[in-house]
Interface confidence: medium
């Protein structure tokens, strides 16, 4: 969880950012109530991007991917790293900067028609059921606006969960990622003891659905650590 990332004081009491005075209404529409933010740039942050711990690419920014900072480093220590530009080495799509994808270990432009064709084959079109959800991440490829609104059904190849239809998430299956169902109450889930440990899974499960959390099954409390069964349970 984020609790292990942010110390208890990091976001408890918000100081007026960059010299703005608390209690003075900002001029921008939808600005934070009571905060004036000089320059009006809603997306800037105060610090100089100290490394942000992560467990998966989707926890990083659009121009980042999640990996160990050192080659062959401890899989349990991962941070958000700057994406790889065109012609740089890669191991998966998310490592490449927006507008590129990973092909044969090299980041190449995704403008090429053959790549769009591959995506069109693997993502089921559902324009009548366009769920723009909280789950959303803009796709890292430069697809047409028509393509942007397609949502993959169960089993469709995906890059991230926003590629999948409502009720599905993008999870690893062997060495690719496909849309799988979000877990329901009572279903077995994976509780990761260490940050980044699910990088080792080749059959990754989705997370538990709304109002559920992944906890040890009641009758398994006495079992050994290695055999504890986790299921999605009501909070």
């Amino acid at each position: 969880t984020l609790n292990s990332v942010l110390n208890s004081n990091a976001i408890k009491n918000l100081p007026p950012p960059l010299g703005g005075a608390a209690g003075h209404p900002g001029s921008a529409v939808s600005a934070a109530p009571g905060i004036l933010y000089p320059g009006g740039n809603k997306y800037q942050t105060i610090d100089n991007y100290q490394p942000y711990p992560c467990a998966e690419d989707e926890e990083c920014g659009t121009d980042e991917y999640c990996a160990s900072p050192t080659r062959g480093g401890d899989a349990g220590v991962q941070i958000c790293l700057a994406c790889r530009k065109r012609r740089k080495r890669c191991m998966r799509h998310a490592m490449c900067c927006p507008g590129n994808y990973c092909k044969n270990g090299i980041c190449v432009s995704s403008d090429q028609n053959h790549f769009r064709g591959e995506i069109e084959e693997t993502i089921t079109e559902s324009f009548g059921n366009d769920h723009s959800t909280l789950d959303g991440y803009s796709r890292r490829t430069t697809l047409s606006s028509k393509m942007y609104h397609t949502k993959g059904q169960e089993g469709s190849v995906c890059l991230r969960s926003s590629d999948c239809a409502s009720g599905l998430c993008c999870a690893r299956h062997f060495w690719s990622k496909i849309c799988k169902p979000v877990l329901k109450e009572g279903q077995v889930c994976t509780k990761h003891r260490r940050k980044g440990s699910h990088g080792l899974e080749i059959f990754q499960r989705c997370y538990c659905g709304e109002g559920l959390s992944c906890r040890i099954q009641k009758d398994h409390h006495q079992a050994s650590n290695s055999s504890r069964l986790h299921t999605c349970q009501r909070h």
């Epitope: 990091a10 809603k42 467990a55 926890e59 723009s132 909280l134 538990c208």
Partner: nanobody, 127 residues
């Protein structure tokens, strides 16, 4: 732009519970984090809880163990379940949505200006 509408506020006795809801509309596909903040009369606004798209959560120390943040992606809705409420929890509660940035930093979640905001819902804890 994301539009956020909170509901569920009201008057509750100490020790009671409330569930706040936040319905998001507009460019919700760009949301990276959904958060709840609160502002008590005469005080600065403070962070309450945040949930990332992937489900990671963080809470202010003052609400840990009492409040639970969650999100239903299919309904574009975030929730704040508040249990064991105390008089000091009395405040206007704001729902907030932050877009996915190009680069993530620890301070991204603490910078109020990164969020779009709802109008707020009043929670009063009093006997």
């Amino acid at each position: 732009e994301v539009q956020l509408v909170e509901s569920g506020g009201g008057l509750v006795q100490p020790g009671g519970s409330l569930r706040l809801s936040c319905a998001a509309s507009g460019r919700t596909f760009s949301n990276f984090a959904m958060g709840w903040f609160r502002q008590a009369p005469g005080k600065e606004r403070e962070f309450v809880a945040v949930i990332l798209r992937g489900g990671s959560t963080n809470y202010a120390d003052s609400v840990k163990g009492r409040f639970t943040i969650s999100a239903d992606n299919s309904k574009n809705t975030a929730y704040l379940q508040m249990n064991s409420l105390k008089p000091e929890d009395t405040a206007v509660y704001y729902c907030a949505a932050a877009p996915r940035p190009k680069r993530v930093s620890v301070s991204y979640f603490s910078t109020a200006s990164n969020y779009d905001w709802g109008q707020g819902t009043l929670v009063t804890v009093s006997s």
